[in-house]
């Protein structure tokens, strides 16, 4: 078979292959940060000569062009500067607003690297219509002035600008706009993974409302649907899996799917993942019919084995025929449901879309969109039983209109979107579900997000002081229960002068609590064993305290999980009648555990628990200390196997401010205590004033550091005694 | 509930490879919390500690059978493996499949197999 | 050095109280397991860590520890209680494991 010639450079930039230079090949264009390839790919022919899609004359001289953003076209009751006929990168747009007019949005705007304007679209109004102004974004014009209720805006886009989002709004009776704000976008622009992740989360999240099913949760404001224990999602997912994907590709469509499908099943919401590829024909890989479909495992499995040669006899995009199997499984459900039955009409239903291009066969996707928009029955009440993300992945042979005609057009949501390659939709997919954000008590969640605060990672962080100084840490464990160390009480302080310092979305400093009661556990004395050499004594280092107030859940509080508590089994997706030892073997599952515990600064930090025939080697050191214990006779009476060990090898150590916090671990994008700070050989903030300043121990040092943790699967009857009615334990 | 089941030949003749597997039920050779072991017991005599295996492939073998001992772990089937080279009579016991767990000072044998009595003759 | 001394024999008459001993270097670092095994089954757990009993197991059956000596203490014997008694401990590192030669109780 001929090849294609290999004269296909591109000045300032760079080219990648789909399959070598054999016909068939699609070979993509990128260039650096700043600047776009026209054209922007081309496809070997079975001739042996390239094309370049969409080209009406001979091949052109691929070059690497500035990449601009689009000026506004016009601006109501206002005026915008500098006036330019579009933006170069890192260029400003102001907005000013006439007397009488307030102005709405971002008053400076700047334009990015890849295209698009950051901040929100300015306008200016004066708060007369039923409906807010709906302003204008850049490179858009409007048709239609009165904002009334029943009252409709149209939108197009000057020149060859694309437009995303909704092309006509109604100004609905609850006084919001239908549908989604129009973005007229460059052809070759695309969009940035952080501001994908947010936009798809945050509907995401909206979608799933990922109740705790063990409480019912009031109705937020917006569109915050609860899937009760009753209720129920489908989950369709679709992979482009045509000739201009990449091998490689695939397998990053597939790993991003895997996320998405591991987040999925962290909410605690019963789910169903359909998985379909699909080329020139669908492949169903997994059917929402199937019962495996419910089954984390199951569904990994089949996606694992989704295989790329699959399709390698029609390469074609047949994006119609996929989203038409989806509508059959639907049918097929409803068949077997029943359609008037509330089983089928309460599940809600969300598609996602990953592809590389437009479809080139099979007819229209909006056709069988509309088949599914039908069969669900979707109409302004029932509107959020279905979302539709479509995903375009390589900015190349994206079709911005065909994909924006078929993502859902919700209000304050995006659900269509085009990044730059692979690895942003990867990056995407690590972000996308962060459910940090809900309201109930859900457990053991937080926001791993790269630009999340200290707090925001780990919520159920606090500070325990007493009037003067602080001293301690603890963790919430439920919304009016800190676990922490006994040894902070050792000195019978009255309670009463102690607050508990809980974290506040309001305020960087946190929000104070009292405490109405602490129960320390009656088997600490710290001088138990004095007699034996021991000078102190940490054995039951635990107490609880009772908050007055509830502590009302938020990004910045929330509760970690216990194991061995039906909580922290929904959030291990473990079966019905899992045990404690089940949640031990799970949770403390190998010679030296990777863990962490939060630092005076607020920050995560690293250590290994040191478990089985490894945790006698890192407690034995503890005898070679002989200013805490002068005349050991026996380690054994010291580190008990209450204790977990850690501050081996590159450990970090905790300070002694540090006592009483979690020790934890995350499994499935949820964080799990399995211990709390108790005492340790070393402390490496001693002499600093600084609480960022911590000081590693010398290698030399006799005896090594090591660090103690109460192990909570050792505490079991003293915690169900007094938790018994605030969590739900399961079985020892 | 764990239950442990050995299986192999009974009868072997001196020189030969004892090879014994442990099928285990009710529990996972791939959890990372448990030392699959294997222990004999001659007849009349005390128990004997041949070997333990975790999962993650590190063993431990009696110094005294060292050189001949083999214990190896097949997550797939959930079994675990004992190879023992060049018997003699001096091998002839009741073997028995065990799991092990360390827990903070002691480490103990909470689940047995049921034994398989190997007999060593020409 | 790697090795549990047990009484080969011991007896008790019914109800009354016995105590069965394992000595052993690696008793100073590591705390005795005991099994009971009954002829012709497979041994059983019966205590392990500093005094530590598996469910099912009667409370009878209790342990200690000093020095380098390991004691099973069961108070109250019962007839079923007749059976072999093995300690093992561990000894070095990792998994090396160590088992006594076995006591047998006999109930008068």
């Known amino acids: 078979a001929p090849s294609c010639p290999q004269n296909v450079n591109i000045s300032g930039g760079t080219f990648t292959l789909s399959h070598g230079w054999a016909p068939g090949s699609l070979l993509t264009y990128s260039c650096p940060q700043g600047l776009y390839p026209s054209p922007a790919s081309r496809l070997c022919k079975s001739s042996g000569q390239w094309q370049t899609p969409g080209a009406t004359r001979s091949l052109s001289k691929a070059v690497c062009k500035p990449v601009r953003c689009p000026a506004p076209v016009s601006f109501e009751n206002g005026i915008y500067t500098p006036r330019l006929g579009s933006y170069p990168v890192g260029g400003n747009v102001s907005f000013e607003c006439e007397d009488g007019f307030i102005l709405r949005g971002s008053p400076v705007r700047q334009c990015r690297p890849n295209g698009m304007w950051d901040g929100e679209t300015a306008v200016c109004d004066n708060g007369a219509g039923h409906c807010p102004n709906p302003g204008i974004s850049l490179g858009a014009v409007r048709t239609g002035f009165r904002f009334g209720h029943g009252d409709k805006v149209r939108y197009r886009c000057s020149s060859n600008l694309v437009l995303t989002g909704s092309s006509e709004r109604e100004c609905q009776g609850n006084g919001v706009w239908s549908g989604t704000e129009p973005i007229c976008r460059q052809p070759y622009s695309y969009d940035f993974p952080e501001d994908v992740a947010p936009a798809l989360g945050t509907s995401f999240s909206h979608m799933l409302g990922a109740t705790n099913p063990t409480q019912k949760t009031k109705e937020s404001l917006g569109r915050k649907i609860q899937i009760q224990r009753s209720g129920h999602l489908n989950l369709y997912l679709l992979l482009d899996c045509s000739q201009s994907v990449s091998e490689n590709d695939f397998l990053i469509f597939k790993e991003s799917a895997s996320l998405m499908v591991d987040r999925i099943f962290s909410f605690e919401i019963n789910v169903s993942v359909a998985i379909i590829t699909f080329a020139s024909e669908p492949k169903v890989l997994m059917s929402v019919l199937n019962d495996n479909s419910r089954d984390m495992t199951e569904v990994i499995s089949s996606l694992e084995n989704a295989n790329y040669k699959d399709h390698e006899n029609g390469t074609g995009t047949n994006t119609y025929a996929a989203l038409n199997s989806v509508y059959l499984m639907m049918n097929n459900q409803m068949r077997l449901l029943g359609m008037e039955t509330m089983a089928w009409q309460e599940i809600r239903h969300a598609i996602i879309l990953l592809t590389d291009g437009k479809s080139n066969m099979g007819g229209s996707p909006k056709t069988a969109v509309d088949h599914i928009r039908e069969i669900l029955n979707i109409n302004q009440k029932r509107n959020d039983y279905l979302d539709i993300y479509a995903i375009g992945v390589g900015k190349l042979d994206v079709d911005w209109r065909e994909l924006n005609e078929l993502g859902s057009k919700k209000d304050g949501e995006r659900h269509a979107f085009i990044l730059q390659d692979t690895k942003a939709l990867h990056q995407v997919f690590e972000h996308m579900l962060d459910v940090s954000k809900l309201t109930d008590t859900i457990c053991g969640v937080g926001n791993m997000s790269a630009n999340a605060s200290d707090q925001e990672r780990t919520p159920w962080h606090v500070t325990i002081k007493p009037k003067s100084q602080e001293t301690c840490r603890g963790a919430l464990i439920s919304d009016q229960w800190v676990l922490t160390a006994a040894h902070c009480f050792r000195d019978g302080n009255d309670h009463s002068l102690w607050r508990v310092n809980v974290g506040d979305p309001k305020s960087q400093w946190g929000k104070e609590f009292l405490i109405e009661k602490a129960v320390i556990s009656p088997g600490f004395d710290v001088f138990a064993k004095k007699n034996q050499g021991i000078l102190e004594f940490y054995g039951d280092d635990i107490a609880l305290l009772k908050l007055a107030q509830k502590v009302k859940m938020s990004t910045h509080a929330r509760p970690i999980c216990l194991p061995c508590t039906m909580e922290a089994n929904l959030a291990l997706r473990r079966p019905q009648g899992s045990t404690c030892r089940d949640h031990e073997n799970e949770l403390l599952n190998k010679q030296s555990v990777p863990a962490h515990f939060v630092a005076l600064n607020g920050s995560k930090l690293n250590i290994n628990l040191k478990m089985g025939v490894e945790w006698t080697s890192c407690a034995e050191v503890v005898s070679q200390e002989k200013t805490m214990f002068p005349n050991l006779t026996d380690v054994r009476e010291v580190v008990t196997d209450q204790f977990l060990c850690s501050g081996t090898q590159e450990d970090e150590s905790p300070c002694k401010g540090e006592s009483g916090g979690a020790v934890f671990l995350e499994r499935r994008f949820r964080f799990f205590q399995v211990g709390l700070v108790s005492w340790g050989l070393y402390n490496p903030c001693l002499g600093s004033a600084d609480k960022n300043s911590r000081k590693r121990a010398p290698r030399s040092k006799v005896p090594p550091p090591r660090d103690f943790h109460i192990n909570l699967f050792r505490m079991q009857p003293w915690l169900r005694q007094h938790l018994g009615d605030v969590l739900n334990f399961l079985p020892l | 509930q764990v239950q442990l089941r050995e299986s192999g030949p009974g009868l072997m003749k001196p020189s030969e490879t004892l090879s014994l597997t442990c099928t285990v039920s009710?529990?996972?050779?791939?959890?990372?919390?448990y030392y699959w072991t294997w222990i004999r017991q001659p007849p009349g005599k005390g128990l004997e500690w041949i070997?333990?295996?975790?999962?993650?492939?590190?063993?431990d073998y009696n110094p005294s059978l060292k050189s001949r001992v083999t214990i190896s772990v097949d997550t797939s089937k959930n079994q675990f493996s004992l190879r023992l080279n060049s018997v003699s009579a001096a091998d002839m016991a009741v073997y028995y499949c065990?799991?092990?767990?360390?827990?903070?000072?002691?480490?103990?044998?909470?689940?047995w197999g049921q034994a398989t009595l190997v007999t060593v003759s020409s | 050095s790697s090795e549990l001394t047990q009484d080969p024999t011991v007896s008790v008459a019914l109800g009354q109280t016995v105590r069965i001993t394992c000595q052993g270097d690696s008793l100073r670092t590591y705390y005795a397991s005991w099994y009971q095994q009954k002829p012709g089954q497979a041994p059983v757990l019966v205590l392990y860590?500093?005094?530590n009993r598996p469910s099912g197991i009667p409370d009878r059956f209790s342990g200690s520890s000093s020095g380098n000596t390991a004691s099973l203490t069961i108070t109250g014997a019962q007839a079923e209680d007749e059976a072999d008694y093995y300690c093992?401990?561990?000894?070095?590192?990792?998994?090396?494991?160590?088992f006594g030669g076995g006591t047998k109780l006999t109930v008068l």
């Open positions: 860590g500093k005094n």
């Open positions: 070997g333990s295996m975790f999962y993650s492939g590190n063993a």
């Open positions: 009710g529990g996972s050779v791939s959890s990372g919390v």
């Open positions: 093992n401990s561990r000894y070095s590192s990792g998994t090396h494991v160590v």
């Open positions: 065990a799991r092990g767990y360390a827990s903070g000072w002691s480490y103990y044998f909470d689940y």
